[in-house]
Amino acid sequence: DGPAGSWEQLIQERRSHEVNPAAHLTGANSSLTGSGGPLLWETQLGLAFLRGLSYHDGALVVTKAGYYYIYSKVQLGGVGCPLGLASTITHGLYKRTPRYPEELELLVSQQSPCGRATSSSRVWWDSSFLGGVVHLEAGEEVVVRVLDERLVRLRDGTRSYFGAFMV
Amino acid sequence: DGPAGSWEQLIQERRSHEVNPAAHLTGANSSLTGSGGPLLWETQLGLAFLRGLSYHDGALVVTKAGYYYIYSKVQLGGVGCPLGLASTITHGLYKRTPRYPEELELLVSQQSPCGRATSSSRVWWDSSFLGGVVHLEAGEEVVVRVLDERLVRLRDGTRSYFGAFMV
Amino acid sequence: DGPAGSWEQLIQERRSHEVNPAAHLTGANSSLTGSGGPLLWETQLGLAFLRGLSYHDGALVVTKAGYYYIYSKVQLGGVGCPLGLASTITHGLYKRTPRYPEELELLVSQQSPCGRATSSSRVWWDSSFLGGVVHLEAGEEVVVRVLDERLVRLRDGTRSYFGAFMV
């Protein structure tokens, strides 16, 4: 690697460092599809942004391979736990890769939020946060799923969200 | 951009990279004011530090614009849920900007921790964690609020805290 | 600092930047020892990796001093809360340093997950997430402890994990 090559590499790195990949996507009225698919997200309005990552049908799409800290929070809430709704909620981050047909679990939480209702109030709120570092190749995608998604509460993009940044 | 300019820029970047802005502030006896204001934090003792960010009256103050991963955890606890104390706790990170008169919600969680008391024990503990990437301009501030703050338990700076770092 | 020195420093920094220290360790069947020691982790299989950090008996070992965002999540679960099991769970990240004989609390959460059992189901699930920035010197170690660890549920490395990256 001659000086010129190193120089070019450094210039290149400086430019890429300026756009260290990062994204923060926010919950919106359209997030819950009821179709069994992943949650959908706002990518531009309010606090939402994409920088060096792209978005497609609920998925953050990696354009530059590397290690990423990925995270998601979902706001859960309800009045009691109606029959037919799972009393156990599963909130997870999953990877889609062209090299494998099924989604791969990355980070997952299970919670039993209905137990938070009290004798004086059947209303309950709970929150689930996930975050961790995973390696992602260019073209791979990460999605958020919540089962049962009917317990996810959306409002203004601050309570349920999904993001990532390269570390 | 001539080689000299690029060189200077790289040197500059190297120096600024050495102090990639970061902070971790910890809970202290003085954190809960009861005044309706944000929580206050320890900035120097123990695990607390400021590096490339400043602090003012509970707020982390941004000196260098950019995308930051901001986070906060609060330890909640109590004996039963006495009347008049909110059975729903709201824990949030909020932005103050000179360009707007009111605080802006960034990341928020609602929880119903009192439902964690059991028949055999009225004592309950719960924890709320928030983290996400937001864009902050120089001079903008981020604060933590908890309603009802009387349910926040402080001890040694490890259970309730507030931090950020540039991504 | 002459141009050559600066150049070397930049080349050095570029190389070190390529391996910005990071790690993500995952829960495994061997994680829970019942010995009173910290949780043990998978370091290589599946989603687990070490980059610029090393591992020893449950501990992430720092090789390069600096500020690190450290995190851990544990999946908790059970059927009721059997007598003799603490109704309060403590989940913490602790530092071991050659300069001090005892472990130092870094980030800690207390939860009362058994209260999540409902009248219709004694099964409960809960999750505890911790994350924050701490300064670590070369040779210092970070471990995860959960009391009572019998309530930690392990499966496939996605529900209980431990990681860090330099910020």
Epitope: S120 | V79, G80, L83, G84, R150 | -
Partner: antibody
Framework: QVQLVQSGAEVKKPGASVKVSCKAS????????VHWVRQAPGQGLEWIGA????????SYNQKFKGRATLTADKSTSTVYMELSSLRSEDTAVYYC??????????????WGQGTLVTVSS | DIVLTQSPDSLAVSLGERATINCKAS??????????MNWYQQKPGQPPKLLIY???NLESGIPDRFSGSGSGTDFTLTISSLQAEDVAVYYC?????????FGQGTKVEIK
């Protein structure tokens, strides 16, 4: 300054009901609980229950559940304690008291002057 | 219910001397370093008056000759230098658990 002013003394027959009022002033009425405590002649203090005027939530000593009813009227900043099926052992001075908190620990920092309820045939 | 037992039932102390009242709970009333125990003073014909909350915090406007201590199940109210106006009945009260309960009272008189 904080004041709790109670209604006057009452004489009731066994089996009847009594409704004692407590008018609050000098603080934000909807931000504090109001508790009721009674004291039989020459005896100690006994907690009856509490009401949170902010939303009307109540908490009762099981001993009085079903007989005591606590309500709050935000428009007049007044709290009421109604005790039904009176018996002679309910003869006591009834106090209202404002509840404050230190974290989740409740204490009674201001008291009404008391209302003597006499149950006699 | 949590039972609070005060001792002694009555106490005669000389002016300027120390008065000590004890309160024992049937179970611990501690949580996370706080003790859910309060103390009140009641003079004849008057309502009770808050002196100490959460075991050791002095209510505003109360003279600092009053102090509270203790944790777990054993608590103490101390009047460091008894004054004539301190003649009254003193009650401990727990707020750890519903129903809130009071001790039976300790009568303090001048010797």
């Amino acid at each position: 300054q904080v004041q709790l002013v109670q209604s006057g003394a009452e004489v009731k027959k066994p089996g009847a009901s009594v409704k004692v009022s407590c008018k609050a002033s000098g603080y934000t009425f909807t931000s504090y609980n109001v508790h009721w405590v009674r004291q039989a002649p020459g005896q100690g203090l006994e907690w009856i229950g509490a009401v949170y005027p902010g939303n009307g939530d109540t908490s009762y000593n099981q001993k009085f559940k079903g007989r005591a009813t606590l309500t709050a009227d935000k428009s007049t900043s007044t709290v009421y304690m109604e005790l039904s099926s009176l018996r002679s052992e309910d003869t006591a001075v009834y106090y209202c008291a404002r509840g404050s908190y230190y974290y989740t620990s409740s204490y009674f920092d201001h008291w009404g002057q008391g209302t003597l309820v006499t149950v006699s045939s | 219910d949590i039972v609070l037992t005060q001792s002694p039932d009555s106490l005669a102390v000389s002016l300027g001397e120390r008065a000590t009242i004890n309160c024992k709970a049937s179970q611990s009333v501690d949580f996370d370093g706080d003790s859910y125990m309060n103390w009140y003073q009641q003079k004849p014909g008057q309502p009770p008056k808050l002196l100490i909350y959460t075991a050791s915090n002095l209510e505003s406007g109360i003279p600092d000759r009053f102090s509270g201590s203790g944790s777990g199940t054993d608590f103490t109210l101390t009047i460091s230098s008894l004054q004539a106006e301190d003649v009254a009945v003193y009650y401990c009260q727990q707020s750890y658990e519903d129903p809130f309960t009071f001790g039976q009272g300790t009568k303090v008189e001048i010797k």
